[in-house]
């Protein structure tokens, strides 16, 4: 009779390399008496006998993985036990080998010049594939701007026009090579002004041609603005060559003005804009103008930024030591006073105060401020802010305000020029043009004035996009 013998594994498990979808077999030869019970584990988890992905034969000595998957890699162990002595164990690794596979291929990309572009290329494979990129017909070289990331993705910093083209990624290991489909990188370029219009000082009645050249991808469109409004007279000629647009505005000069060239192009849902301005002043213009102590310049402050036309020149009164600062403080103080007024009144009052303290300016030989048109002042006083204005005047009469209306730097409407007499001699408030079309209920006006004085504002001569600050609740 045979003597009992503890199990001995005569053929230890070895590392097995297998390709995906192929068969992989581990052999665990055991000598023992009586016959041992052999169990198998993967990563220390028991493999169940009835798992159809495996075949266990030869009394458990042969484990076959019928169709290897990527997730099958790990440490496989056989454990033999027959009750004599201790159980014995042998382990080996399964290394799943895999041809390169691109799991997340690159896609077509539109990107704005100067931004960062990332073309994805996520791969699988064992050994881990190396990823390279091809642009057009040539291998892409990495440099300070262009890098292939650890993930395989291509990152291009500060994208340039010359980066545009067709790209594909290549994943390679010892078992083979995979190519992505060709994708297109399109580089869009913000509108940029190449040649700004030049300022002119001319005699009354002269012809002047202002020229503005812009570039961009897609090719920009050019529009012209005169003192904050669309150009109402003059002829425009345009030509396009090699993504460069050239626009020429010919004008007959009867008054000074600030002319702004605006180049715009579209990037998806967004627009990019570039601006350049030129002044046309009239020599000897001062003869018909009253002498004013001040200068014309752009507004640099914060408070009226959303109210004043972006490119407009405004008047700074040099009777103040620091005109910019003094006028900004006045408007800031006024702004705080306006916090208490109604949502109907506040934006109208803001438009009035900003345009009154920072009056549009004609930059002739003698800088001349352009006051607000009387009709717009009255619209604020008797329409938008009727209640507030009356309350303020009432408090002034009762001595609650020492200086009455002068607590706010409010213009005296009756002293302002009428737009019906000379539309070019005063400033409109575009906000009111826009808003009067949208007001369905007017505040009750109990005014001592004859009803004829309640303003009838003209139809707006230009479209005016209301700032979000002007939304009314």
């Amino acid at each position: 009779e045979k003597l009992p013998k503890a199990p001995v594994i005569t053929t230890p498990l070895e590392t097995v390399d297998a390709l995906v979808e192929e068969v992989a077999t581990f052999m665990c030869a055991v000598e023992s008496y009586p016959q041992p019970e052999i169990s198998w584990t993967r990563n220390k988890i028991l493999i169940k006998l009835f798992d159809t992905r495996y075949s266990i034969r030869e009394n458990g000595q042969l484990l076959t993985i019928l169709s290897v998957e990527d997730s099958d890699d790990g440490i496989y162990c056989c454990i033999a036990n027959n009750g004599v002595g201790g159980a014995v164990e042998s382990c080996g690794a399964l290394q799943v080998k895999m041809k390169p596979k691109i799991t997340r291929p690159p896609i077509n990309v539109k990107i704005i010049e100067g931004l960062k572009a990332v073309l994805p290329c996520t791969t699988m494979g064992n050994p881990k594939p190396s990823v390279s990129w091809i642009k057009g017909d040539n291998a892409l070289r990495e440099n300070s701007r262009i890098a292939v990331l650890e993930s395989g993705s291509l990152r291009i910093h500060n994208v340039q026009k010359e980066d545009a083209g067709q790209y594909r990624c290549v994943a390679k290991n010892s078992l083979g090579t995979a190519y992505s489909k060709l994708v297109k990188l399109e580089v869009e370029v913000f509108a940029r002004i190449l040649r700004a219009p030049e300022s002119h000082n001319v005699t009354f009645g002269s012809f002047v041609t202002l020229r503005c050249t812009a570039i961009g991808i897609p090719v920009p469109t050019i529009s012209w603005i005169e003192n904050g409004n669309a150009v109402s007279s003059g002829s425009i000629q345009e030509s396009v060559k090699d993504r460069v647009i050239d626009s020429r505005l010919q004008l007959f000069i009867t008054k000074p003005g600030l002319y702004t060239c605006i180049a715009t192009n579209k990037h998806g849902e967004k627009f990019s804009t570039a601006k350049a301005a030129a002044t046309v002043s009239i020599a000897e213009w001062s003869k018909s103008q009253k002498d004013s102590q001040g200068y014309c310049a752009q507004y640099r402050g914060e408070v009226c930024d959303a109210v004043l036309a972006k490119d407009a020149l405004v008047f700074f009164n040099t009777s103040y030591r620091d005109p910019e600062d003094a006028q900004e403080l006045l408007i800031h103080t006024a702004w705080n006073e306006l916090k208490a007024v109604s949502p109907l009144c506040r934006p109208a009052a803001e438009a009035l105060l900003c345009n009154h303290l920072f009056q549009e300016c004609s930059p002739g030989v003698v800088p001349t401020p352009m006051p607000i048109c009387r009709e717009y002042c009255l619209a604020v006083k008797e329409l938008f802010c009727a209640k507030e204005w009356q309350a303020m005047e009432g408090k002034a009469h009762r001595g609650l305000y020492r200086s009455g209306m002068h607590l706010l730097p409010v213009p005296e409407c009756s002293k302002l020029p009428s737009m019906h007499r000379d539309p070019t001699a005063c400033t409109r408030l575009p906000y009111l043009d826009y808003k009067k079309e949208n007001i369905t209920t007017f505040p009750s006006i109990t005014s001592s004035r004859p009803s004829a004085d309640i303003p009838n504002l003209p139809a707006s001569t230009s479209s005016f996009a209301v700032s979000p600050a002007y939304s009314m609740t």
């Epitope: 190449l194 700004a196 990019s272 030129a278 310049a297 640099r300 914060e302």
Partner: antibody, heavy 121, light 112 residues
Framework: ELQLVESGGGLVQPGGSLRLSCAAS????????MSWVRQAPGKGLEWVSA????????YYKESVKGRFTISRDNAKKTLYLQMNSLKSEDTAVYYC??????????????WGQGTLVTVSS | QAVVTQEPSLSVSPGGTVTLTCGLS?????????PDWYQQTPGQAPRGLIY???SRHSGVPSRFSGSISGNKAALTITGAQPEDEADYYC????????????FGGGTKLTVL
């Protein structure tokens, strides 16, 4: 005597962060706009950021937008510049400068002595 | 974006007059650019000289004057002194899509 004293500079690795401070004294801090201006070694001056007297708006040079944040604490008479995702090209002496008026933009009439920021691995 | 241009270097004899200019790569410098001028001597922080085209900062000698001439801003030093040897920077306010303050590359002035 009017004084602006910067601090917080030092050596930092690319991608790192620093917070610069500028302590003001000798003037009414909350009456003036402030700016940060930098100067790379051997190079010219470069405006970085500005803030008006009340902190109501902030303005930045295009290349630092989204990475740098200017702020001020008028009670502490201090101006700050929080710098994130630093790059080697941000290496410079950073000056804190006082505006001659309330608004953010305009002439800078007083400057600190600067603090050196070095971005290097 | 427009680049602010300055002469890289200039020289002047003591007592002489020199004009430094500040232009824009595209377009003209106007009062709306509020030209400012700064002086920086080696190892020192900059100091303001001229603001808003032609106003002198307090304590700045009257030999420094600012103007707009043609399509450029100009800083004129009349009766240059040895201590005027320094780097001079002009700065312009710009408004395109956002507000910016842009310095020129600087002019190295040598008083021979």
């Amino acid at each position: 005597e009017l004084q602006l004293v910067e601090s917080g500079g030092g050596l930092v690795q690319p991608g790192g962060s620093l917070r610069l401070s500028c302590a003001a004294s000798g003037f009414t801090f909350d009456d003036y706009g402030m700016s940060w201006v930098r100067q790379a070694p051997g190079k010219g001056l470069e405006w970085v950021s500005a803030i008006p007297w009340n902190g109501g708006s902030t303005y930045y040079k295009e290349s630092v937008k989204g990475r740098f944040t200017i702020s001020r604490d008028n009670a502490k008479k201090t101006l700050y510049l929080q710098m994130n995702s630093l790059k080697s090209e941000d290496t410079a002496v950073y000056y804190c400068a006082k505006r001659s008026g309330r608004i953010a933009f305009g002439a800078l009439d007083a400057w600190g002595q600067g603090t050196l920021v070095t971005v290097s691995s | 974006q427009a680049v602010v241009t300055q002469e890289p270097s200039l020289s002047v004899s003591p007592g002489g007059t020199v004009t430094l200019t500040c232009g824009l790569s595209s377009g003209s410098v106007t009062a709306s650019n509020y030209p400012d001028w700064y002086q920086q001597t080696p190892g020192q922080a900059p100091r303001g000289l001229i603001y808003s085209t032609d106003s002198r900062h307090s304590g700045v000698p009257s030999r420094f004057s600012g103007s707009i001439s043609g399509n450029k801003a100009a800083l004129t030093i009349t009766g240059a002194q040895p201590e005027d040897e320094a780097d001079y920077y002009c700065a312009l306010y710009m408004y395109s899509d956002s507000k910016l303050y842009v310095f020129g590359g600087g002019t190295k002035l040598t008083v021979l």
